[in-house]
């Protein structure tokens, strides 16, 4: 059986579409399943894995790799 | 199970900034973007934009770029959606909704915000 | 930016009836589509997604099909409670339009 594009699995029933944007940041697997493009998490990997360090109650990041700093504090670590 | 509540309905003055507030819970904030929707009366759904939790990141459609501003706060979940300079167009009802897993559109939503704008 | 179409903007029906709603994108969004179910006052509900899938606890005589630009939704048999208005989404890329809405009236 041959699925339809971005659809995978026993019965083509699996839907995966590999997306590099605001959205999402994965390629899909032979399944159907999200693989995460390198400095990405999350069940959608939309979420940007910050510097190693980076205090998570003060810091954050948009991109990879980043810390950026909450109101009041600062730092390379935001610590 | 995901829950979406929504900040109560807004009066407010043409040229005027209105903040709608919607908590979540039932699920880790930061994993999904939250959408914002809105339906003026009597007529259909306009997408205005999303926030990523996480990180701050945002993407806005061109139509309210400059004049809506979403933010979230991780500390308590909640995301907020501030429109400035109102006018009469700018009367609807105001939802908050996040997709739902793998890849589904807007699965949860909130109740709706409306906001009324009228000197 | 894609633009959705959807027709028709209304449409009586009687309960039994077999209904179709068609939406029409202004470029290929791949099977990225969903179909929303609205009652007045209240939030959208999602139907389908992913143009054909079914969401959780909807009933099967709802069915979504289509491909490419082209996409429909079908009722096979009309009950009371499916008397509502009907919006087509497509998800492919920001921004993620709306159809304008169907409404389906009791004849």
């Known amino acids: 059986v041959t699925c339809d594009d971005y659809y995978y699995g026993f019965g083509c029933n699996k839907f995966c579409r590999p997306r590099d944007d605001f959205f999402g940041h994965y390629a899909c697997d032979q399944n159907g399943n999200k693989t995460c493009m390198e400095g990405w998490m999350g069940p959608e990997c939309n979420r940007a894995i910050c510097r190693q360090g980076c205090s998570p109650k003060h810091g954050s990041c948009k991109l990879p790799g980043d810390c950026r700093c909450q109101y009041g504090w600062q730092g390379l670590y935001c610590d | 199970q995901v829950q979406l509540v929504q900040s109560g309905a807004e009066l407010k003055k043409p040229g005027s900034s209105v903040k709608v507030s919607c908590k979540a819970s039932g699920y880790t904030f930061t994993d999904y973007e939250m959408h914002w929707v809105r339906q003026a009366p009597g007529q259909g759904l306009e997408w205005m934009g999303a926030?990523?939790?996480?990180?701050?990141?945002?993407a806005y459609a061109q139509k309210f770029k400059g004049r809506v501003t979403l933010t979230a706060d991780k500390s308590t979940s909640t995301a907020y959606m501030e429109l400035s300079s109102l006018r009469s167009e700018d009367t609807a009802v105001y939802y908050c909704?996040?997709?739902?897993?793998?890849?589904?559109?807007?699965?949860?939503w909130g109740q709706g915000t409306l906001v009324t704008v009228s000197s | 930016d894609i633009q959705m179409t959807q027709s028709p903007s209304s449409l009586s029906a009687s309960v039994g009836d077999r209904v179709t709603i068609t939406c029409r994108a202004s470029?290929?969004?791949?099977?990225?589509l969903a179909w929303y179910q609205q009652k007045p006052g209240k939030a959208p509900k999602l139907l389908i997604y992913n143009a054909k899938t079914l969401a959780d606890a909807v009933p099967s005589r709802f069915s979504g099909s289509g491909s490419g630009t082209d996409y429909t939704l079908t009722i096979s048999s009309l009950q009371p409670e499916d008397f509502a208005t009907y919006y087509c989404q497509h998800f492919w890329s920001a921004p993620w339009t709306f159809g304008q809405g169907t409404k389906l009236e009791i004849k």
């Open positions: 470029g290929n969004i791949h099977n990225y």
């Open positions: 926030i990523q939790p996480g990180g701050g990141g945002t």
């Open positions: 909704t996040r997709r739902g897993y793998d890849d589904y559109p807007f699965a949860y």
